[in-house]
Every structure is written in C-alpha cells, then in structure tokens.
C-alpha cells in the first residue's frame, strides 16, 4: 500500500553466516541503527555467532564482538552457539538482549548446551551476561590429594604414575575441577596449590616434577589437617566439592590426633577417599590389620564406596580406574541421568522483554519439552517440571514439545501482564499456552489453543497487538509457517480476539495463492501504524516464497481487529535480486529516515533490507451541485 | 636415657591454681604426646589429660575439665599443667608420662611424680 | 566412654604361683591395651603393650592375651619383685583419651 518498493536500503552482510536473521531497529539518542543477527558468524576459528549494528542512512555495518564474550569460571564451548538466534529491545532504555542458544559448557565428560544471552546498552556496549540456566557442574570440585612421601614409601616413581594417572581422569578447568597437592611425612608442604594450573596438562607437568620428600615419621593426621585448613583455604572455591585423596603405605605417628582431624573434616564437608598402600607389610610380612581399620578410619562412610589398597606401590596403577569412577559417582549423586532438566535447555531461543525483566524460551529444557524462565533484577524464576503437566501430560513427555520456541506476552484490562509460549511439536500438531509466572517456580495457564495440522509447527511464532494502541492486547496472532496445503508447506497465521478474558479463533490471515513453499507465519510482527490511520498493523514473512526469494504481507489494523487480507505484498524479486528468504525477520517500530512515517526492517540471508513508507495522502472528495 | 621430671607440686588451699612442669629429656616432645595420670592417697591411677605437642590436640578428663589445660613448650620441651579452682578431691601425686606411636601408643616412661595437697 | 573392669581387686599368692589378672571392657575395643606395675611409693612401669606384646626389659614370665573384650595378664611363676599393683589401660582408637583399670593388688599369701 504506501511502503516504497522502488528504493529500498539492502544492506549486505555474511551468507554464509546468515546475517539478516533477526532484525531490529535501534535508537540512541536520536541516532538510529540496525541491529542485526548473524548466528553462523565466526570469530576467530569459531563460528560463534555475532550481531552489527549497521546505520540506517549510509556506511557500513559493524560487528559488536559479542561472540568474544567470555563466562568466568566455566569451560565454555562458543562453537556454534548460535549468538543472534534471537534478539530482543527493551524500548524503555534502547538496551537489547542477543542470545546465544547453544551456547555450552562443559561438565565433566558432557557437554551442556544451556543457552546464554548478553545485554548490550544503548550505545552497543555489552553490559552483562544473561544466563539463568546455568548451573554448577557437578564436577565443581577442590580436590586435595595427601601423598605420603615418608621414607617408607618405595619405588616413589609408582607413585608418581599413580598420581600422573589419576590426573588425567580429572576434568580440570574453570568451573570444574581444580586439584592441589600435599605431601607429608615429619613435616607437610604444598606441592601445589589448587588454583596452580587450570588445566590437566599443566597440573600433570606439575605432578610429574614432584620429588619425594622421606622422612622417617608418617604424620598422616597432620597431614589431613594441613590439607583441611590450608590446602582447601589457598585457591578453594565457595561452594566447590571438598574432596580429598589420602594416600599412604603406614600406620601413622599421629593416630591419636585422628579423631579430631576427621570430625574437623566432616564438618567441613570434605569427602575423604584414602588408599592404603601394603608394600611396606607386605615386604616384611608384618600383619596389617592396625593400618587398615586406621584407613578405613580416614576414609569417609561407605568403606566401600571410599577406601582402597593396593598390595604395593606398581599396583596403584589398577585403581585409577575405580577411585575416578568413585568420585564422579558424586556428579550423579540424587539424579536420575536418564533425565534433563536445564542441562540442554538452549536458553534465549527465543526472548522477550517484560516490565521487571527477559522471558527467555528454553526448547531443550526438562527433556526438550521445553520452558519458559524469566530473569529480573532480583534473580531468576525457574517453573518446576511439573508446573507444566496441565497442559503438557506425563504421556507425552518423550515427544519433545519445544515450548519456549517463541515468547510474547499480552495484556488484558482484567489480568495485566500475561505471558504467551509456544510449543510447536506438541503433541505433533503444536501448542500456545498463556500463562503467568510465580516466584515459587509454579505457573497458572490461563489459556492453551492447539494447532489442527501435525506438522504445522503451530506456536513456532507468536506476535501480540494492540491496534488501538490503548495499553490492551487486541489480538494475538499465531503462526503455522508449516501448515501444508495444495500440496505444499503454505503455512497459516491463526487470528485471535480477546473477548473479556479469552483469546477467541477468528479466522486466519490470507496469503497469495502460489504454488510453491511459502511458510508464510514464519514471521509476524506487530508494527506501528504504517499507514497513517492510527491503527498499528502487522506484517508477515513468507520467506520461501517465489522460489525462497521471499516476500512480505502488510496487514491493517482496523477498530480494535485486523484486517484479514494484505493491503500490500512486497516480493525480494521487486526490491534486488539475489535477494534469498527475505522476510525471516520484521522489525517496524521507528521511524529510521525522520520523515515522521513509521520505517520496516526485513531480514533475508545475508541482507538486511530497509523498506521506507510513504506519506498516505487522503482525498475527501466532496460534491457541490449549482445550482443546488 | 629418657627423662621426666615433675615439679611445682605442693600445698594449696581449695580454689587456688598451681602449674605443674614436666620436663623432658632424651627424647623430642615434638614427636609424642605428654599425658598426665594422678594417683589419690591410696587409691588407683586417674588419667587426667593429654596433649600432642606437635598439634596441640589436647584431651581432658571430665573431672577436671574448665578448671585444668594442659600445654607444651617444644623449644623447652617442656610440658604443662595448669589448674585451677582447685578442689581437695584433686589431692594426689601428679605424672606425667609419655605416650607415643613406638610403644604402640602405650605409657612408656613416667616421672616420678609431684604431690599436690589441697586443703584449708 | 569405655570402661576398664579389672579383676581381682586383690589377691594373695605365693612364690611360684601362676597369677592371672583380667580386665574386661565395657564394649568392643582395639587392642591399645596396656599392663602397668606399681610399687608403693614409686610411679607405674609398663609391662605389656598391644595387649600382648612385652616391653623391653621385662620379664618373660609376664605374658598378656585378648579373648574378645577380656584382656588377661598373666604371671607364670610370681617372684617376690612381683608383689605390686598392677593396672590395666585401653587406649581410645584415634584420641589420647585413656582408661584405667581399677588395680589388682597382689599379696603375699
């Protein structure tokens, strides 16, 4: 109807890292931007993702570097973590959130892809990191092992085999495992300290120089007491797994101080495994009995499950194996590993901004059946898995519903703030439930409208409007981009009135009749009044349409509803050529060029297309007859 | 030769202190533990307390716990006991003894003991 | 806590005599058990270690043995230097906390 089709901006960018893929439109203090997704982005060897801020008029695109955007204390895994997939403007203080869903760390020997987003300021300046998914590894451990380097011991270099092996099993790094080492006889001294080396080949070089120390006394008590109040003190973690690993071939000089050492470690909380080394009994044929009840004395209960030995010093070697697996029984304690929670839960693959904070879609949590978290200033709400079994049953848990693939929110005059999800496999045909959220982890769904077609990956988008810009959602739109018809992936966008407190079917948007895929829904976006008759509207991307060119649908608001049939259809093939999925992503909230017209921001692969409307020049025709 | 010595014993009346010293010889109190045993006018051997002098770990009967504390000066090494609020039931001759890994955590030397009165 | 339970609290014995002391504990312990011989006058001598091991010096006609929770001194043939007391110890497994029998008191007959 009054876009211009004639001199569109195209901006270019990366294909092959899809840049276009979301679009938004940015303001800094008059100065207007573009700001763009790039999920296949690469930086350096990564393909991280990334976002530019291109200017609207002229010039270049500039990348914002939030790929390099680094998480203390995890081992982190940026390689395809999709940064761009989604992105999200908070107009109250032009900040935005960029999310990265399948960003990962790693937790000992899995990787888990929890999603992480950035919030960028209004000057483009990343500001903080938006993660609510994440969660301690398992294997966030301070171990301390105790080595007895008495005189007794001998061949020392088994025990340095022994140590160098067990190393190797330990999955050291930032948020996981950290090690130090003690080695005792008539005195005790750090070999190293447990945030020495961030890694296992650091810690490995480090252990393989350690030399024995002798001594003709075995201070074991001490030696334990040393590793509890320095050992764990020098580099130990707030919150870390206390673990420590005593290792000697005697009975010590200081039993009597036992006791006391092992209640002070228990009430620290460190969980004790010892090896009992026999090649000093076994060489002289002395019974080891006293020596093996004061090991099983050290090592924390179960003995079964924490005390070991070994005939001598060469058979250190057979227990790698066994201690390792011990200790990162811890990781699974209380879980059932069959079971995800928030581990793959792809956080920010889908986002929107609310009053107190980010709704973030998380497809891959609880199973991949899907949630919704909130982060606000004051934390994070998390709704339990069970929260969800109203309207997502028990049954169908192994069916991978995806809820969180998009987010939105409503507002109605009797409910304020509701929230809207939706879950595109659910149950095959697909799903959206309205909902709110309480800081108890527990959610009320109001409402839940089921998708007719399996595979038609209803829920897959969701765009809320309020035509009459009064504050109150209007309609809430609803796409099947899927939705197969005539022989081919048509898609359908599903109209939704509220009427009190419902969202009442009323209808769907129309689309061209070509006979070719289209996915038409595959975007829907809620944009400021295009053409001048104060009735915000919408647009629709179809971007395979016209051979995955793709193309665009304005649709009119009207008195409180939307017009169902496109008031104007705008095809790449008019604006450029190559252009190739234009219309994965609309954004039309400013006005970019300052000619008082609301402008259209459209993504396709590798572009991103500025549209500029035109005035609406309304003639009021009026007829005088003379003479009357 | 290994050696202990009492001394410090002697006449108090009910709720004063004393401070026992046991000196050592022949041996490094760095390595073992000093305990004290007392022995009422004619009656048995009451252990008293126990300290490791290299961890300072000590132990205390009940008899005479909050009222007595047990010490040890490595670089005297010597050994101390000090009580007070003394009662007249702590009448009795005062020893310390060593106790360590070598006598398979056994008394193995003993003084020959310090007698403390406590009366009025 | 543990208790020593030793018994006799007295004997009477003659020269050549096999005296056997016992100590009973109030419940399972290792075997930290010590003997120690007194004299009037003078402070306790150790005798046996580990229940069962005789310290250096001593006799050999002193002998100790563990039957479960009893602990049993034993001389074979008493000599006129054995007329003492003689005490039985435990000692608590991973503390110096120790306890002391009451005493046997052994007699000339």
């Known amino acids: 109807f009054n876009m211009d089709t004639r001199k569109p901006r195209v901006i270019p960018g990366s294909r092959t890292a899809f840049f276009g893929y979301t679009v938004q439109q940015h303001d800094i203090s008059g100065n207007k931007w573009l700001v763009v997704g790039a999920p296949l982005e690469t930086n350096g060897y990564q393909k991280t993702g990334d976002v530019y801020k291109c200017p609207v008029i002229h010039g270049n695109c500039t990348k914002l570097n939030l790929g390099r955007v680094t998480l203390s204390n995890v081992s982190e895994r940026k390689d395809n973590m999709r940064l761009g997939l989604s992105l999200a403007t908070n107009p109250k203080d032009n900040s935005f959130l960029a999310c990265s869903p399948l960003w990962s760390h790693e937790c000992g020997s899995s990787y888990y892809t929890t999603g992480m987003c950035s919030r960028v300021n209004s000057n483009f300046r990343f500001s903080k990191t938006v993660a609510p998914a994440l969660q301690r590894c398992q294997t966030y451990m301070d171990i301390v092992i105790v080595l007895d380097g008495s005189n007794s011991i001998y061949p020392w270099v088994e025990v340095q085999h022994f140590l160098i092996n067990i190393l190797k099993k330990f999955y050291i790094g930032p948020g996981q495992i950290q090690v130090g080492v003690v080695q005792y006889g008539e005195d005790v001294v750090h070999e190293f300290h447990l945030n020495d080396y961030r890694s296992v080949k650091d810690v490995v070089e480090a252990a393989s120089h350690i030399e024995q120390r002798g001594g003709t006394e075995t201070r074991t008590a001490f030696g334990i007491e040393f590793a509890r109040s320095e050992a764990f003190q020098k580099g130990g973690r707030k919150g870390a797994k206390k673990v420590m690993i005593v290792i000697t071939d005697g009975e010590s000089h200081d039993s009597p101080d036992l006791e006391k050492v092992i209640q002070q470690s228990e009430r620290d909380n460190v969980t004790r495994y010892a090896v009992a080394v026999l090649g000093y009994y076994n060489r002289r044929g002395i019974n080891p009995e006293t020596f093996l009840n004061e090991i099983k004395y050290i090592a924390s209960d179960p003995d079964d499950k924490h005390f070991f030995n070994v005939t001598d010093e060469a058979a250190l070697k057979d227990i790698v194996d066994a201690l390792g697996d011990r200790i990162f029984s811890l990781e699974g304690t209380n879980k059932n590993e069959t079971s995800f929670g928030l581990e793959m839960s792809q956080t920010g693959f889908s986002s929107h901004v609310v009053e107190d904070g980010v709704l973030l879609g998380a497809v891959g949590a609880y199973d991949w059946n899907g949630a919704v978290l909130k982060e606000t200033s004051a934390g994070k709400v998390i709704p339990l898995r069970e929260s969800y079994l109203k309207e997502f049953p028990e049954e169908l848990k192994n069916h991978g519903a995806y809820l969180g693939y998009t987010v939105t929110s409503v507002v109605s005059s009797r409910q304020g703030r509701v929230y809207v999800a939706g879950a595109p496999r659910f149950n095959h045909t697909g799903k959206v439930i309205l909902f709110t959220m309480h800081n108890n982890r527990s959610l009320t769904i109001h409402q839940a409208m089921r998708g007719q077609q399996i595979g038609s990956y209803f829920g897959s988008e969701i765009t809320s409007v309020d035509i009459d810009g009064d504050g109150v959602t209007d309609v809430l739109l609803v796409g099947a981009p899927m939705y197969f018809n005539e022989g081919r992936e048509r898609g359908k966008v599903y109209v939704y009135e509220l009427r009190q407190n419902l969202f009442v079917y009323n209808g769907t948007l129309k689309d061209s009749h070509s006979y070719q895929n289209a996915r038409f829904g595959s975007s829907i976006a809620s944009v400021r009044d295009l053409n001048q008759d104060s009735y915000n509207d919408v647009v629709v991307g179809a971007p395979l349409e016209d051979n995955h060119a793709g193309a665009i649908y304005i649709f009119h608001g009207f008195r409180g509803s939307i017009l169902k049939t496109p008031k104007q259809r705008i095809t790449a093939s008019e604006l450029a050529t190559g252009l190739q999925y234009f219309g994965c992503s609309i954004h039309g909230q400013l006005d970019l060029n300052e000619d008082g017209l609301i402008d259209l921001a459209v993504g396709a692969l590798g572009n991103a297309v500025i549209l500029w409307s035109r005035p609406v020049v309304q003639i009021n025709a009026s007829l005088h007859f003379e003479p009357s | 030769e290994v050696q202990l010595v009492e001394s410090g014993g002697g006449l108090v009346q009910p709720g004063g202190s004393l401070r026992l010293s046991c000196a050592a010889s022949g041996f490094n109190l760095y390595s073992s533990y000093i305990h004290w045993v007392r022995q009422a006018p004619g009656k048995g051997l009451e252990w008293v307390a126990s300290?490791?002098?290299?961890?300072?770990?000590?132990y205390y009967a009940d008899s005479v716990k909050g009222r007595f504390t047990i010490s040890a000066d490595t670089s005297k090494n010597t050994a101390y006991l000090q009580m007070n609020s003394l009662r007249a039931e702590d009448t009795a001759v005062y020893y310390c003894?060593?106790?360590?890994?070598?006598?398979?955590?056994?008394?193995?030397?003993w003084g020959q003991g310090t007698l403390v009165t406590v009366s009025s | 806590d543990i208790q020593m339970t030793q018994s006799p609290s007295s004997l009477s014995a003659s020269v050549g005599d096999r005296v056997t002391i016992t100590c009973r504990a109030s419940?399972?312990?290792?075997?930290?058990v010590a003997w120690y011989q007194q004299k009037p006058g003078k402070a306790p001598k150790l005798l046996i270690y580990?229940?069962?091991d005789l310290y250096s010096g001593v006799p050999s006609r002193f002998s100790g043995s563990r039957s479960g929770t009893d602990f049993t001194l034993t001389i074979s043939s008493l000599q006129p230097e054995d007329f003492a007391t003689y005490y039985c110890?435990?000692?608590?497994?991973?503390?110096?906390?120790?306890?002391f029998g009451q005493g046997t008191k052994v007699e000339i007959k």
């Open positions: 580990s229940a069962s």
């Open positions: 419940q399972s312990v290792s075997s930290a």
């Open positions: 003894a060593r106790y360590w890994y070598y006598s398979a955590w056994a008394l193995d030397y």
């Open positions: 110890q435990q000692s608590a497994p991973y503390s110096s906390l120790i306890t």
């Open positions: 300290i490791s002098s290299y961890s300072s770990y000590t």
